[in-house]
Amino acid sequence: CDLPQTHSLGHRRTMMLLAQMRRISLFSCLKDRHDFRFPQEEFDGNQFQKAEAISVLHEVIQQTFNLFSTKDSSVAWDERLLDKLYTELYQQLNDLEACVMQEVWVGGTPLMNEDSILAVRKYFQRITLYLTEKKYSPCAWEVVRAEIMRSFSSSRNLQERLRRKE
């Protein structure tokens, strides 16, 4: 499955939206910094099957969508920008889902290794736990927004490697 060019554009637009969403300076939130143990190894590997890479990308986008579509998120961010973010993420999920169906099932057998997906889930679980502990404060959301940008940046690198493999 070839990811459409629009997927890369959507990814870029998502990064721009996340950047525009910033409400306060990260420098004023230094005391709230947190290491979420981003699973970098899941985004570095050239050892990835294409199916696995697509599934990891899908999981990152799905978890990002879930994170920003909570009640607490809608209070924290500009509604107009959030709506645009949902649209971008939803489109990317659709692009990837079409690919997942083609790549993951070959001859009726699933090729997915769940380990990478679980690493992504544990990472997002730490993010949601952090937000809960910080009572969804503006600084906590700002730290999380910056962290999601970082994870999207790594996702982009994985996408680029996927494109080069095609």
């Epitope: 143990r37 699973p39 879930n66 769940e114 380990d115 889930r121 544990k122 679980q125």
Partner: antibody, heavy 122, light 107 residues
């Protein structure tokens, strides 16, 4: 086949130290949280602590924090629960459990060890 | 901590009967409710996760429902194996907590 195999029963005196183990096999060790659950004989279940074997990130039940510690040895896919000074009230069965984590980030305990009975008595 | 209260605490029934066990949480736990069965002398085993999902290998006689602060476990056509203690659990907030258990015995 997923297996969590726990060490045998232990009889200890108050004040002694103890480390019990849970050897896992049948899946990628670093992919799933592991928890310990206590059951005092004839009583209910209490969650104690969980650990991510990937980087030893831990979350404790405040009721147990400071009294027990959890650790892992990735090289032998084993999780440990340790006491530096046992009390009679630590007498219980201790279960290690594997967590599954759904896409909506719901934890549940999908595989349990057979349990280790710890008896603390003078 | 989120308190989990099961009712009834004990229950008598016969093979072939249907029974329902209820679990109430002291605050909303969404669908982060799970049910376990513990046979005497054995480790607990997962029956239902996320309020209503049947764990692989568990017979369809077990059904779970509910969300928010209340969920129920229903067992239809009781089998001899089902006489055991049942626990609900929440994993919505730390610390994770269990109900006190419901002992199901033979009438």
């Amino acid at each position: 086949e997923v297996q969590l195999v726990q060490a045998g029963a232990e009889v200890k005196a108050p004040g002694e130290s103890l480390r019990i183990s849970c050897k896992v096999s049948g899946y990628t060790f670093t992919s799933y949280w592991i928890s310990w659950v206590r059951q005092i004989p004839g009583k209910g279940l209490e969650w104690m602590v969980k650990i991510d074997p990937r980087d030893s990130y831990t979350i404790y039940n405040p009721s147990f924090q400071g009294h027990v510690s959890i650790s892992v040895d990735k090289s032998i896919t084993t999780v440990y629960l340790q006491w530096s000074s046992l009390q009679a009230s630590d007498t219980a069965i201790y279960y290690c459990v594997r967590h599954y984590l759904t896409q909506s980030l719901v934890d549940y305990f999908d595989h349990w060890g057979q349990g280790t009975l710890v008896a603390v008595s003078s | 901590d989120i308190q989990m209260t099961q009712s009834p605490s004990s229950l008598s029934a016969s093979v072939g009967d249907s029974v329902t066990i209820t679990c109430r949480a002291s605050q909303s736990v969404s669908n982060y409710f799970h049910w376990y069965r513990q046979k005497p002398g054995k480790a607990p085993e997962l029956l239902i996760y996320s309020a209503s999902n049947l764990q692989t290998g568990v017979p369809s006689r077990f059904t779970g429902s509910g969300s928010g602060t209340e969920c129920t476990l229903t067992i239809t056509s009781l089998q001899p194996d089902d006489f055991a203690t049942y626990y609900c659990q929440q994993t919505h907030g730390y610390p994770f907590t269990f109900g006190q258990g419901t002992k199901l015995d033979v009438r």
